[in-house]
Interface confidence: low
């Protein structure tokens, strides 16, 4: 006989990512005896909450909380019962709620209070429901990506922790209502609001981050729709042969389309809008989203926002990944270079509705919007953030790393549960439980 080492006890953490279009629940796990090790926290399971994001329940706050129940019931099953009381539970809301908080702060408070009431009914260690700032969303996405890819520290074969020489990855997140760019930079930011100083594992990181509200995929599509109604009476980014009834109240209810809102419009009026498959007009429409006219700093990305030159490799996730994956997988188009990405966007925008449906059978939802989405991603990366061909070569489009979704949720939990220490780890020996 020989002694058999028991596998270590696991700890769990739950994050509800309350995005603008939907809510996702992520359950993370890690060995209790290795809490400060890097790359040790992984995704245990996930659950997509049915229905829209919690911000869509502004008129029905209790509906927001009720929508979460299915996933919370799943969490009761996924986390061992004896671990329930010690499992932290967080809800973080992003740009959808930031927008609601701007237009109707009472409604956003009511939604959060309703959600809080429901979350406290569960046996987990509920630690709050709150709206993340754009900076948080960007930085926690960056932390997640670099934690999962073990860019902070790594355990070497000689039994020592060391900082890998490859440096950190930049992170680009394209949500439904905002987009974030975050990367390590050597020089101080000219706009201090865009700089975050981090101390992780005894290393100091100076990080540039900026979140562009209203530049998430869904809000961009709404803004393009408003522009198309305003300037063309048809939609150059939609495929020819595609037509739909547009409810004006839906188009203009967002603060993101406020600037395009006609002075006197009937919110219950419906307008018929048709696509024209015009890549050049579509490109012009998308270009109108970016302003390069004034910059109060030595250099800017767009809209007068300071940004140092993009440096190093980047991981682009969420809708960046979905858009590029559609071009690559569904359309079979190469997207390895910026030129190819632009050509792919033009290709999609040239397709008629019939051609698009034949090429991508069974994917009706949002199919008409992929031209605008692809054109926007291409313009945001090249003109907006200033990626040239060389820099673009260092961008990987990824949904997961180490079987864990890349997004702000893991980084948020790591921070709030102090799973990334500021101090460097001592000389520790690893224990293999395999």
């Amino acid at each position: 006989t020989r002694d058999v080492r028991e596998p270590p006890a696991l700890k769990y953490g739950i994050v509800l990512d309350a995005g603008s279009s939907h809510t996702s629940m992520f359950i993370y796990k890690w060995p209790a005896d290795k809490e400060n090790d890097t790359g040790i926290v992984g995704q245990h399971s996930s659950c997509d909450v049915p229905g829209g994001g919690i911000s869509s329940y502004a008129d029905n706050p209790s509906g927001a909380s009720q929508s979460l129940v299915g996933c919370l019931e799943q969490a009761l099953q996924d986390v061992p019962k004896e671990r329930h009381a010690g499992t932290p539970l967080y809800l973080g809301a992003t740009a959808g709620m930031r927008l609601l908080n701007l237009t109707n702060p009472e409604a956003s408070t009511s939604v959060l209070m309703a959600v809080t009431h429901t979350l406290t009914q569960y046996p987990f260690d509920f630690r709050g429901a709150r709206i993340l700032s754009g900076q948080e969303e960007g930085v926690f996405g960056w932390v997640t990506a670099n934690y999962l890819l073990e860019n902070f520290i790594k355990y070497g074969w000689v039994g020592r922790w060391f900082r890998p020489r490859k440096g950190t990855l930049g992170a680009m997140d394209l949500g439904g209502a905002s987009t974030q760019i975050t990367f390590e930079t050597t020089s101080p930011a000219e706009d201090r609001a865009s700089e975050v100083q981090l101390h992780l594992y005894g290393q100091h990181y100076r990080v540039y981050t900026h979140s562009f509200l209203c530049y998430g995929r869904d809000q961009v599509l709404q803004r393009l729709l408003a522009s198309a109604l305003q300037t063309h009476g048809f939609h150059p980014c939609w495929p020819r042969g595609f037509s739909t009834q547009v409810l004006l109240g839906d188009v203009y209810q967002s603060p993101c389309t406020m600037a395009q809102r006609p002075q006197n419009f009937n919110s219950s009026a419906r307008v018929s809008l048709s696509g024209s498959s015009d890549p050049h007009l579509c490109r012009d429409l998308v270009s109108g989203l970016f302003s390069f006219s004034s910059c109060p700093f030595s250099r800017c990305s767009f809209n007068g926002v300071f940004q140092p030159p993009v440096a190093g490799n980047f991981v682009a996730f969420s809708a960046f990944f979905y858009t590029v994956d559609f071009l690559r997988t569904s359309m079979g188009l190469p997207v390895a270079t910026l030129q190819q990405l632009e050509a792919a966007a033009v290709n999609v925008c040239n397709q008629t509705w019939a051609q698009l449906q034949a090429r991508v059978p069974g994917q009706r939802a949002r199919l008409a919007d992929y031209c605008a989405g692809a054109m926007f991603v291409q313009q945001l990366l090249s003109r907006g953030y200033g990626f040239d061909e060389r820099a673009f070569g260092g961008v990987i489009f990824q949904k997961k790393a180490a079987d864990t979704a890349v997004g702000w949720a893991l980084g948020y939990m790591l921070n709030l549960t102090n799973l990334i220490p500021a101090d460097p780890p001592g000389l520790r020996k690893g224990t293999d439980f395999s």
Partner: antibody, heavy 125, light 106 residues
């Protein structure tokens, strides 16, 4: 330098209203939220509410909803707080405070970095 | 709402002495700020985000803590430190303050 100058002391009768002001200087008024805090004699400080001058959006502590109304005049870089239906328990020093923030680890940590000198409101018949 | 309880309510110290003021939260908070208020004056920011010294505050002041328990330490008390010290949480709405600790100098 950054300064918040509040209006002078007020003595008001029960049931009346009072509007106190807080003039900001030395910084861009619309870049920071302005909060109001109550300090009643022998009591702890209580947060009343705040206003975002850029968007004219105010948020209140539930306890002060209906009691306090916070507004701004952007052109005058001035925040106001009106207290209505005054009672003896509203007797207190009221402070305006600028909501500063410190960005660390991606989180905006808010705090009150500059305070007005305070306005004493006495409710007495 | 989160209730912050400060102890002791009053503290008497001699110049040069090291003292510690505590602030206990009714449930976990992410960070705490500390303010100093002298008689007839408005509160003044002392320490923000648990341990960061505000501009112009002497290095003898320091803060630490996490979760539900936070402390403010004055390493060598000076006569001008006589004041009421308040802790303040901004983790959970509505934002709340502690009841204060009054520091008297012997």
């Amino acid at each position: 330098q950054v300064q918040l100058v509040q209006s002078g002391a007020e003595v008001v009768k029960p049931g009346a209203s009072v509007k106190i002001s807080c003039k900001a200087s030395g910084y861009t008024f619309t870049d920071y939220n302005m909060d109001w805090v109550k300090q009643a004699p022998g009591q702890r400080l209580e947060w009343i509410g705040d206003i975002n001058p850029k968007y004219d959006i105010s948020t209140y502590n539930q306890q002060f909803k209906g009691k306090a109304t916070i507004t701004v005049d952007k052109s005058a870089s001035t925040a106001y707080m009106e207290l209505s239906s005054l009672r003896s328990e509203d007797t207190a020093v009221y402070y305006c405070a600028r909501r500063g923030f410190f960005l660390y680890y991606g989180i905006n940590y808010y705090y009150f970095d500059v305070w007005g000198q305070g306005t004493l409101v006495t409710v007495s018949s | 709402e989160i209730v912050l309880t400060q102890s002791p309510a009053t503290l008497s110290a001699s110049p040069g002495e090291e003292i510690t003021l505590s602030c206990s939260a009714s449930s976990s908070v992410s960070y705490i700020h500390w303010y100093q208020q002298k008689p007839g004056q408005a509160p003044r920011l002392l320490i923000y985000s648990t341990s960061n010294l505000a501009s112009g505050i002497p290095a003898r002041f320091s803060g630490s803590g996490s979760g539900t328990f936070y402390t403010l330490t004055i390493s060598s008390v000076e006569p001008e430190d006589a004041a009421v010290y308040y802790c303040h949480q901004w983790s959970s709405y509505p934002w709340t303050f502690g009841g204060g600790t009054k520091l008297e100098i012997k």
